[in-house]
Interface confidence: low
């Protein structure tokens, strides 16, 4: 094939072509969480496995200290699943008394931090009430969407309660991003 | 535009450029499942529609005998949703007696099989307790993430109980993968 | 690097190469919904923010009147999350009487409309029974998959009950699509 069949002169191109295998990508998997002090008004962040098993980072996408570092500006697909597990929710007794109440809940947030700006940006949130009667319970929350990110942005996953996160299997709780 | 604007000489390229429309892709949709014998310690695999309606396979991504066949090595985004439906969960009676118990559950697993390796690898799992009292219930489990796959790998979707899978509509239960 | 390393002569190319940053993409976020008359047999469609905050449309992907307009044919990844919230489900009283019943439910559908064809096509559906006793409840439904779309196709998100949609935060309820 001739060169021009690859890059026709009439084509509008706003960015240079690049090989897809060269794009920043990461898939991180759950590890046992070490309890940490977290800010009073912010959900704690999870830390992750970035090398072993199914986990990887490539093409300058790096993982450090709970953050995925965005190495170049562009549109990224960002995703995470967190599987939660717990004992009977407190709200069951109140429910049996027939009174509406604010239920217990589980929440996952994918957050963007930009060093030049003090306030984190919540990109994605999955939040669910949990009102299970008389049993252990477990369930996943999945999130994924596309965002325009800037070089130097950092991504993390925050949860409402680290003690409820199922860290037992790499396929149950994970976090990833890739440049489109 | 000049050729070099498409492929600047300073660009590091780790793989040859390729047209996006040429990449292996598949979206499979649910069909009525025929009961099959499955291995004692492994969840049964679903089989799928690969041609009709919304379903398709393209660019050497083939479907055969419950498996998606990976035709070339690279990073793939893999996803599935399974909608489950059932009658009242067994655990409801025990719950009413006020005793905690191991609840019924629904589980989806996306599994990778590599012929050269005996053990399947669980890539993704969505698992949820189901403890519904006195009603029919239905709910989806969605999964999706990126994995580095090798030519010849095979992907399948396993579920905890085939009889609970909603096979009535192609938009409720599906399975797909595409090379990034 | 030489040009032929970018576009090797042995490579089969079915479509011209293009810069990834030039592909149609959109991420839309929730806004407060204005009640509208909807067709008797069709769930109401949500309308969306397309410019402010995290929302954007680019490269000829336009949003108008509840629809994302597909500007060129190809394979798209399409996704949405809708967070629902409500008061105790009606079914609780019937459940307490010990009789199975058809539960309340929440449903999200991503629908494709093609002007040349009278019937909309349901691409994705997430549907869930809701039978919560004695409490407020909230929960997300997430959907995402790949579809072959044609130039001129229109995508929308329909829900079973607009009044239950959580419109308070752009990270809770969203809708997007991008050309692969």
């Amino acid at each position: 094939l001739k060169g021009q069949e690859f890059a026709p002169s009439h084509q509008q191109v706003y960015a240079p072509l690049r090989a897809d295998g060269d794009k920043p990508r990461a898939h991180l998997t759950v590890v046992r969480q070490t309890p940490t002090q977290h800010l009073k008004n912010q959900f704690p962040a999870l830390h992750w496995e970035h090398e072993l098993g199914l986990a990887f980072t490539k093409n300058r996408m790096n993982y450090t200290n709970k953050f995925l570092l965005i190495p170049e500006s562009g549109d990224y697909f960002v995703y995470s699943q967190v599987t939660f597990r717990g004992m009977t929710s407190e709200c069951s007794e109140i429910r049996q008394a027939g009174r509406p109440n604010k239920p217990d809940s589980i929440t996952v947030v994918i957050t963007k931090v930009t060093d030049s700006y003090p306030e984190p940006t919540q990109l994605l949130m999955g939040t669910k009430s949990v009102c299970e009667v008389g049993s252990n319970w477990f369930q996943p929350i999945y999130l994924g969407a596309m965002f325009s990110l800037q070089e130097g942005d950092k991504l993390m996953v925050n949860v409402s309660d680290i003690s409820l996160v199922d860290y037992t299997k790499e396929d149950k709780t994970f976090f990833g991003a890739f440049l489109l | 535009l000049k050729g070099q604007e498409f492929a600047p000489s300073h660009q590091q390229v780790y793989a040859p450029l390729r047209a996006d429309g040429d990449k292996p892709r598949a979206h499979l949709t649910v069909v009525r499942q025929t009961p099959t014998q499955h291995l004692k310690n492994q969840f049964p695999a679903l089989h799928w529609e690969h041609e009709l309606g919304l379903a398709f396979t393209k660019n050497r991504m083939n479907y055969t005998n419950k498996f998606l066949l990976i035709p070339e090595s690279g990073d793939y985004f893999v996803y599935s949703q399974v909608t489950f439906r059932g009658m009242t969960s067994e655990c409801s009676e025990i719950r009413q007696a006020g005793r905690p118990n191991k609840p019924d559950s629904i589980t989806v697993v996306i599994t990778k099989v590599t012929d050269s390796y005996p053990e399947p690898t669980q890539l993704l799992m969505g698992t949820k307790s189901v403890c519904e009292v006195g009603s029919n219930w239905f709910q989806p489990i969605y999964l999706g993430a990126m994995f580095s796959l090798q030519e010849g790998d095979k992907l399948m979707v396993n579920v905890s109980d085939i009889s609970l899978v909603d096979y009535t509509k192609e938009d409720k239960t599906f399975f797909g993968a595409f090379l990034l | 690097l030489k040009g032929q390393e970018f576009a090797p002569s042995h490579q089969q190319v079915y479509a011209p190469l293009r810069a990834d940053g030039d592909k149609p993409r959109a991420h839309l976020t929730v806004v407060r919904q204005t009640p509208t008359q909807h067709l008797k047999n069709q769930f109401p469609a949500l309308h969306w923010e397309h410019e402010l905050g995290l929302a954007f449309t680019k490269n000829r992907m336009n949003y108008t009147n509840k629809f994302l307009l597909i500007p060129e044919s190809g394979d798209y990844f399409v996704y949405s999350q809708v967070t629902f919230r409500g008061m105790t489900s009606e079914c609780s009283e019937i459940r307490q009487a010990g009789r199975p019943n058809k539960p309340d439910s929440i449903t999200v559908v991503i629908t494709k409309v093609t002007d040349s064809y009278p019937e909309p096509t349901q691409l994705l559906m997430g549907t869930k029974s809701v039978c919560e006793v004695g409490s407020n409840w909230f929960q997300p439904i997430y959907l995402g998959a790949m579809f072959s779309l044609q130039e001129g196709d229109k995508l929308m998100v329909n829900v079973s009950d607009i009044s239950l949609v959580d419109y308070t935060k752009e990270d809770k309820t969203f809708f997007g699509a991008f050309l692969l």
């Epitope: 706003y14 963007k112 930009t114 030049s116 700006y117 003090p118 306030e119 940006t121 800037q150 | - | 410019e51 402010l52 905050g53 954007f56 449309t57 680019k58 490269n59 000829r60 992907m61 336009n62 500007p71 752009e170």
Partner: antibody
């Protein structure tokens, strides 16, 4: 209703710096760009730059790089513009305006006079 | 930078007349998302500019329907069907498609 309230007039000496403010109300401050515009006496309008309050991202007209610095305080829904190394050329009315798909709401303007 | 050229510089009219102001951009101001962010503003003495028209032809809320915008690519027009006393002032076109955003030089609408 949407309002942008700007700080009062400033008289400053050449070489000094000044900080102008623009307090937003009536909408979600973090979601919408704040733009700044300069108007010299009897002249037209010049765009200085914008800031996106949610993450502090900025974009400047090259002409004003080094002259203007845009910042925000989300806790008070206030945008600021610092002007440095002032000269008589900086004497002007400065407007803040929010940009949705247009500069739909403007502040009343702050008059800056640079004089010794 | 995109240069926005407005004509005429001054437009003397009688009340009740139709007025037309032209704005030409030095290059296309179609954004990569397909939208054209071309706006018209009116500034009266001692006041801040007020938005009249956005995205070429959309009237801002509260703007009377005697104001209309049209055009595409690089040529745009603001029309006032019947000029009223409150319409007098300086009109500016503005493009928000390409950074740096730029204003036209202004057109003064005044009584003959």
């Amino acid at each position: 209703q949407v309002q942008l309230q700007q700080s009062g007039p400033e008289l400053v000496k050449p070489g000094a710096s000044v900080k102008l403010s623009c307090k937003a109300s009536g909408y979600t401050f973090t979601s919408i760009d704040i733009n700044w515009v300069k108007q010299r006496p009897g002249q037209g309008l010049e765009w200085i730059g914008w800031i996106y309050p949610r993450d502090g991202r900025t974009n400047y007209n090259e002409k004003f790089k080094g002259k203007a610095t845009l910042t925000v305080d989300t806790s008070s829904s206030t945008a600021y513009m610092d002007l440095h190394s002032l000269t008589s050329e900086d004497s002007a009315v400065y407007f803040c305006a929010r940009y949705t798909s247009s500069l739909d709401y403007w502040g009343q303007g702050t008059t800056l006079t640079v004089s010794s | 930078d995109v240069v926005m050229t407005q004509t005429p510089l001054s437009l003397p009219v009688s009340l009740g007349d139709q007025a037309s102001i032209s704005c030409r951009s030095s290059q296309s101001i179609v954004h990569s998302n397909g939208n054209t962010y071309l706006e018209w503003y009116l500034q009266k003495p001692g006041q801040s500019p007020k938005l009249l028209i956005y995205k070429v032809s959309n009237r801002f809320s509260g703007v009377p329907d005697r104001f209309s915008g049209s055009g595409s690519g690089t040529d745009f027009t603001l029309k006032i069907s019947r000029v009223e006393a409150e319409d007098l002032g300086v009109y500016y076109c503005f493009q928000g498609s390409h950074v740096p955003y730029t204003f036209g030089g202004g057109t003064k609408l005044e009584i003959k």
